[in-house]
Amino acid sequence: SVPPMVNVTRSEASEGNITVTCRASSFYPRNITLTWRQDGVSLSHDTQQWGDVLPDGNGTYQTWVATRICQGEEQRFTCYMEHSGNHSTHPVPSG
C-alpha cells in the first residue's frame, strides 16, 4: 500500500466563518476514511462535504473533506485519516 499525504488548508468563507479542507493524495488502495472531528468526537455528516475518491494519474488516488467553522474555533477541529490500518490526525493551521 502507499500511504496518503494529508494537507489541511483554510480559506475565508463568509464574515466570521472559514472553510477548512483536508486533502489526502497519492494513496493506494483507494479505500480511505477522511473525516473531521470536533472536540474530539465525530462531526455530524451533514456539516461535512466529501469529494469523490479519484485517480490522480500516477496509479494512486486523491480525495478531500471540508467543513465550515467559526473563525477563532480552529483549535476545536482535527482531520482524521485512516488508510490500510494506519491513521493520523491533522490540526487546522493557524491563520
Partner: antibody, heavy 119, light 107 residues
Framework: DVQLQGSGPGLVKPSQSLSLTCSVT???????YYWNWIRQFPGNKLEWM?????????NYNPSLKNRISITRDTSKNQFFLKLSSVTTEDTATYYC???DGRGAWFAYWAQGTLVTVSA | DIQMTQSPASLSASVGETVTITCRAS??????LAWYQQKQGKSPQLLVY???TLADGVPSRFSGSGSGTQYSLKINSLQPEDFGNYYC?????????FGAGTKVEIK
C-alpha cells in the same frame, strides 16, 4: 509533565451541593485540551460527567444537565465541579481527567476523590 | 445515547494464556473506541485508542481490533500484572459512555 490532582470534602449531606477542585500543574488549562470530570459508582460503573474546554466552553452529560456546573479559575490553573441537589445515588469516586482534540480518550487522570452522600 | 455492552463480566485465566474481551456498541462508532485498565484503588489507565492504537508505554501483548459495532481487546501471554478491571469507552458522540467492565483474575 502534566499532573492533575482532585480535592474536596469526602462527605456531603443529601440535598446539598457537592463541590470538587482539580488542580493542574505542568500545563496551562487555557492553552489546549478538554478538562473533564468522570465518576465511578460503587460497583465500578464509570460515568462521564462533562468538560470545560481550553476556551472555556462546556459540554455536560444530559443525564446531569440541570444539576452540573464545571467552571475554572485560570489564575490558579484549576477547574471545578459543582453538583447540586445530591442524593445517596451520587456517592462515587470522582476523577478529573484530560483529553485532547485528536480524540476524546482520557490519557491523563487524577487519583480519585471518594465522596459519600449521607445524612 | 450509545450504549456499550462488555463481555464477559469476569474471567479467570492462567499466566501465559491468551484472553479476549469484547465490547458491543448500540450503534456504529466507526472505530472511535478506547480501552482502559484499572487496578484496585487506582485510576484507569489508557491502553488503546482509535480501536487499534496502543497508548504510549503499553506492552505489545495488548492489541485492539474491531469495526462497526463490535470491538475486542486481546491480551497475549497473560502476565500477573495484567489482573484488574478493563473498560471500553466510545467517543463517537456525546455523551461519552463506558462499558460496565470486565474483571480479569489470574488463576
Amino acid at each position: 509533565d502534566v499532573q492533575l490532582q482532585g480535592s474536596g470534602p469526602g462527605l456531603v449531606k443529601p440535598s446539598q451541593s457537592l463541590s470538587l477542585t482539580c488542580s493542574v500543574t505542568g500545563y496551562s488549562i487555557t492553552n489546549d485540551y478538554y478538562w473533564n470530570w468522570i465518576r465511578q459508582f460503587p460497583g465500578n460503573k464509570l460515568e462521564w460527567m462533562g468538560f470545560i474546554s481550553f476556551g472555556g466552553s462546556n459540554n455536560y452529560n444530559p443525564s446531569l444537565k440541570n444539576r452540573i456546573s464545571i467552571t475554572r479559575d485560570t489564575s490558579k490553573n484549576q477547574f471545578f465541579l459543582k453538583l447540586s441537589s445530591v442524593t445517596t445515588e451520587d456517592t462515587a469516586t470522582y476523577y478529573c481527567a484530560r483529553y485532547d482534540g485528536r480524540g476524546a480518550w482520557f490519557a491523563y487522570w487524577a487519583q480519585g476523590t471518594l465522596v459519600t452522600v449521607s445524612a | 445515547d450509545i450504549q456499550m455492552t462488555q463481555s464477559p463480566a469476569s474471567l479467570s485465566a492462567s499466566v501465559g494464556e491468551t484472553v479476549t474481551i469484547t465490547c458491543r456498541a448500540s450503534g456504529n462508532i466507526h472505530n472511535y473506541l478506547a480501552w482502559y485498565q484499572q487496578k484496585q484503588g487506582k485510576s484507569p489507565q489508557l491502553l488503546v485508542y482509535d480501536a487499534i492504537t496502543l497508548a504510549d508505554g503499553v506492552p505489545s501483548r495488548f492489541s485492539g481490533s474491531g469495526s462497526g459495532t463490535q470491538y475486542s481487546l486481546k491480551i497475549n501471554s497473560l502476565q500477573p500484572e495484567d489482573f484488574g478491571n478493563y473498560y471500553c469507552q466510545h467517543f463517537w458522540s456525546f455523551p461519552l459512555t463506558f462499558g460496565a467492565g470486565t474483571k480479569v483474575e489470574i488463576k
